[in-house]
């Protein structure tokens, strides 16, 4: 007789979840020599531990600590990248600018990226058929709850100038229920951080409207103000071009604004 | 049916190396992970590590570091252990045993012991 | 490490008997436990894991309980092949570690 399993509205564990954890923990490792030390085997279990036999919608950051702890990595404070709606170019960025990081070129962002993962109350199974939908559910599940654990801490190393990348072709700009957004500008720290500079990313090509005057961004400036780090804005027009010159900056077309 | 079935005993001078062999069969040898546990003459068990064969990474326990190699060859389906350094403490039936990758479930299936006596 | 201490070392009983055997991890493990049956010259045969699920084709009379740092073995009626040395091992974390084991032999 088939055990009853919870039905939760959002997508399953990623199919060989503990297989791409692991795989993505040797190849990182092996690609990031300050990390060689570190145990993938141990990193599993750590990760496994914080969401296996529990229930799903009551996951604490303290169920990640050890995972946390295991995944320690100095980045470089002051080369940081938020982004917020608009990973793939931040990644294509951090690709090319290779001396700063967002929160998947470190270890545990990178492990757990594009990733869903969950478990049952009392038994040591993978929940592979449905993990609750944030919304629908609850919040405090094995997901979020990593990703804003994760997120906080990577918000409270930053230092000097922080950047955010900013999705232009959204409604909400700047959306105070994102991860960035309810997290991680709540999260750095005024006496370390000195400005956030945030670039809006433009979608329609013959977009040349001021997207930092837009109210959402003047709203992201007053919380930022308001905890005492000041704030700046720029307009990416183009982003094809933006990371173009990221790769050729001596290119003579990269003088102009972009 | 899974078997592990490992290599014969083994008899070493001290300062030698020893190396055992664990050949899977009745499995997917790439979809599981392999131990090795020792047990000395009347004592308990002793985790020494374990090898994952899919990603060809392997651990050990900080008491054998330096001193332990722990192999698989996906071509063959075979763990191999190999101990160096040997001294007279290392006496022992050397035992492997598989658990899954993802380390949910015990030792589920072991080998049948290989007896290493290291002696001048 | 964590430290997996059981108790007693060794105990006599009698076919039928209930037994007990316990094991205390020297910090949290959550469910990650298993109890392994060991006969003379023979490889461990594990017979509980995640502290309380019986391994496929162990008798019923096998249980186990507990989770965090105290867990319990019982035999529920004690037959002439139990006879044997147990041991509880963590895989909570690395190394993975085993009780020193507890024989059971017979009064």
């Known amino acids: 007789v088939p055990r009853w399993r919870q039905q939760w509205s959002g997508p399953g564990t990623t199919k060989r979840f503990p297989e791409t954890v692991l795989a993505r923990c040797v190849k990182y490792t092996e690609i990031h020599p300050e990390m060689r030390h570190v145990d993938c085997q141990s990193v599993w279990d750590a990760f496994k531990g914080a969401f296996i036999s529990k229930h799903p919608c009551n996951i604490t950051e303290e169920d990640y600590q050890p995972l946390m702890k295991l995944g320690t990595q100095t980045v470089p404070c002051n080369k940081i990248l938020l982004w917020s709606r608009i990973k793939d170019l931040a990644h294509q960025f951090t690709q090319v600018q290779r001396d700063m990081f967002t929160l998947e070129d470190t270890l545990l962002g990178y492990l757990a990226d594009d990733l869903t993962w969950c478990g049952e109350f009392n038994t040591s199974k993978i929940n592979y058929q449905s993990c609750p939908d944030w919304r629908k559910d609850c919040s405090n599940n094995p997901v979020s709850v990593f990703w804003k654990t994760v997120s906080r801490r990577f918000a409270e190393a930053a230092c000097d100038v922080v950047h955010v990348m900013l999705n232009g072709s959204r409604s909400k700009i700047f959306d105070k229920n994102s991860t960035f957004g309810s997290v991680e500008v709540h999260n750095l720290q005024p006496e370390k951080v000195q400005t956030l500079e945030a670039w809006v990313i433009h979608g329609g090509r013959e977009d040349s409207r001021d997207l930092c005057q837009d109210p959402t961004i003047k709203e992201l400036e007053s919380i930022i103000s308001k905890r005492n780090i000041q704030f700046s804005c720029k307009n990416i027009y183009r982003p094809d071009k933006f990371l173009q010159c990221v790769k050729n900056p001596e290119d003579s077309s990269c003088t102009s604004e972009i | 049916e899974v078997q592990l079935v490992q290599s014969g005993a083994e008899v070493k001078k001290p300062g030698s190396s020893v190396k055992v062999s664990c050949k899977a069969s009745g499995g997917t040898f790439s979809s599981y992970a392999f131990s090795w546990v020792r047990q000395a003459p009347g004592q308990g068990l002793e985790w020494m590590g374990r090898v994952i064969p899919q990603l060809g990474i392997a651990n050990s326990a900080q008491k054998f570091q330096g001193r332990v190699t722990i192999t698989a060859d996906k071509s063959t389906s075979t763990a191999y252990m190999e101990l160096s350094s040997l001294r007279s403490e290392d006496t022992a039936v050397y035992y492997c045993?598989?658990?899954?990758?993802?380390?949910?479930?015990?030792?589920?299936?072991w080998g049948q012991g290989t007896l290493v006596t290291v002696s001048s | 490490d964590i430290q997996m201490t059981q108790s007693p070392s060794s105990l006599s009983a009698s076919v039928g008997d209930r037994v007990t055997i316990t094991c205390r991890a020297s910090q949290g493990i959550s469910s990650w436990l298993a109890w392994y049956q060991q006969k003379p010259e023979k490889a461990p045969k594990s017979l509980i894991y995640a502290a309380s699920s019986l391994q496929s084709g162990v008798p019923s009379r096998f249980s186990g309980s507990g989770s965090g740092t105290d867990f319990t073995l019982t035999i529920s009626s004690l037959q002439p092949e139990d006879f044997a040395t147990y041991y509880c091992q963590q895989y909570n974390s690395y190394p993975r570690t085993f009780g020193q084991g507890t024989k059971v032999e017979i009064k």
């Open positions: 045993a598989r658990d899954d990758i993802a380390a949910l479930g015990p030792f589920d299936y």
